[in-house]
Amino acid sequence: EEELQVIQPEKSVSVAAGESATLNCTATSLIPVGPIQWFRGVGPGRELIYHQKEGHFPRVTPVSDPTKRNNMDFSIRISNITPADAGTYYCVKFRKGSPDVELKSGAGTELSVRAKPS
């Protein structure tokens, strides 16, 4: 059984202010069971951007159906980007538990925000 990998194919993404940013992430295995979460930054101060199973994230939508059996595409789209959204985003796989246990993180995708074209 191959070891789970979390793949973020783009090291960086540049988006104009006001547009939407797509952050890509795929997993190589459905096992073990557990959610994907997206964070900005690392360490204890990291910011939760999206949780696959719970919470309300009005600017974030999954690119693929998170409820679909066998879905391994955990890419997200963030709307109405502002300069405050700049940073490095990590797609992180957790193992289901009480609480969920962090298993593996993607390498991160740096989001840079360009000035809105005049």
Epitope: L30, I31, T61, D65, T67, K68, R69, N70
Partner: antibody, heavy 124, light 106 residues
């Protein structure tokens, strides 16, 4: 009790269009994916289309791809199947189904409830 | 399509197993009972082994490797029906088996 009531069947003309509606009750409609399944006379079950609980994601069987549109109105607890360019092969009983808290459209292993069905006959 | 036997038979009180294979990798199976053509199917097992509240405990489901199994213990005459399995293939499309006719002898 969970109920799924289909309507909109009947005699249809080849090349025409039909619109089937399923009204759900007895459960939190917006929390469950829904599917349409059909059964031609004397044949087995065939998956037609499915839709995620929030309506953002839709799925279609090969036999109706490009001719069908599935949609839902969670406020009205309804799911609709529109099928265009009808053929004789679309003659069947169409069942509305509910997923039981797992999976999405196309995940037939998750179906936990069925409607009574509505009969569609495509004939000139 | 999923693969299931065309027919099985059992005497009342016996245990019968119906198998289903061909679903996508890591997928689950559901089982649907249809007592007569044109009558609405009834879910007896979903998500491999979950049983709707109105289904007797004589019905159980399991999955080993990529094969799903419906087990009916203490078979009764009223269990005579066609049983369909359902799942999704690797592309995510819904698929059914062709159906297994259960005949209760005697």
């Amino acid at each position: 009790a969970v109920t799924l009531d289909e309507s909109g069947g009947g005699l249809q003309t080849p090349g025409g269009a039909l619109s089937l509606v399923c009204k759900g009750s007895g459960f939190t409609f917006s929390s469950h994916a829904m599917n349409w399944v059909r059964q031609a006379p004397g044949k087995g079950l065939e998956w037609v289309a499915g839709i995620s609980s929030d309506g953002r994601f839709t799925y279609y069987g090969a036999a109706v791809q490009g001719r069908a549109t599935i949609s839902r109105d969670n406020g009205q607890s309804t799911v609709r199947l529109q099928l265009n360019n009808l053929r004789a092969e679309d003659t069947a009983t169409y069942y509305c189904t509910k997923n039981g808290g797992c999976g999405s459209g196309g995940d037939l292993d998750c179906i936990d409830a069925w409607g009574h069905g509505t009969e569609v006959i495509v004939s000139s | 399509a999923l693969t299931q036997p065309a027919s099985v038979s059992a005497n009342p009180g016996e245990t019968v197993e119906i198998t289903c294979s061909g679903g996508g990798s890591n997928n689950a199976y559901g089982w649907f009972q249809q007592k007569s053509p044109g009558s609405a199917p009834l879910t007896v097992i979903y998500d491999n082994g979950k049983r709707p509240s109105d289904i007797p405990s004589r019905f159980s489901g399991s999955k080993s490797d990529s094969t799903g199994t419906l087990t009916i213990t203490r078979v009764q005459a009223e269990d005579e029906a066609v049983y369909y399995c359902g799942s999704a293939d690797n592309s995510g499309a819904g698929v059914f088996g062709a159906g297994t006719t259960l005949t209760v002898l005697g």
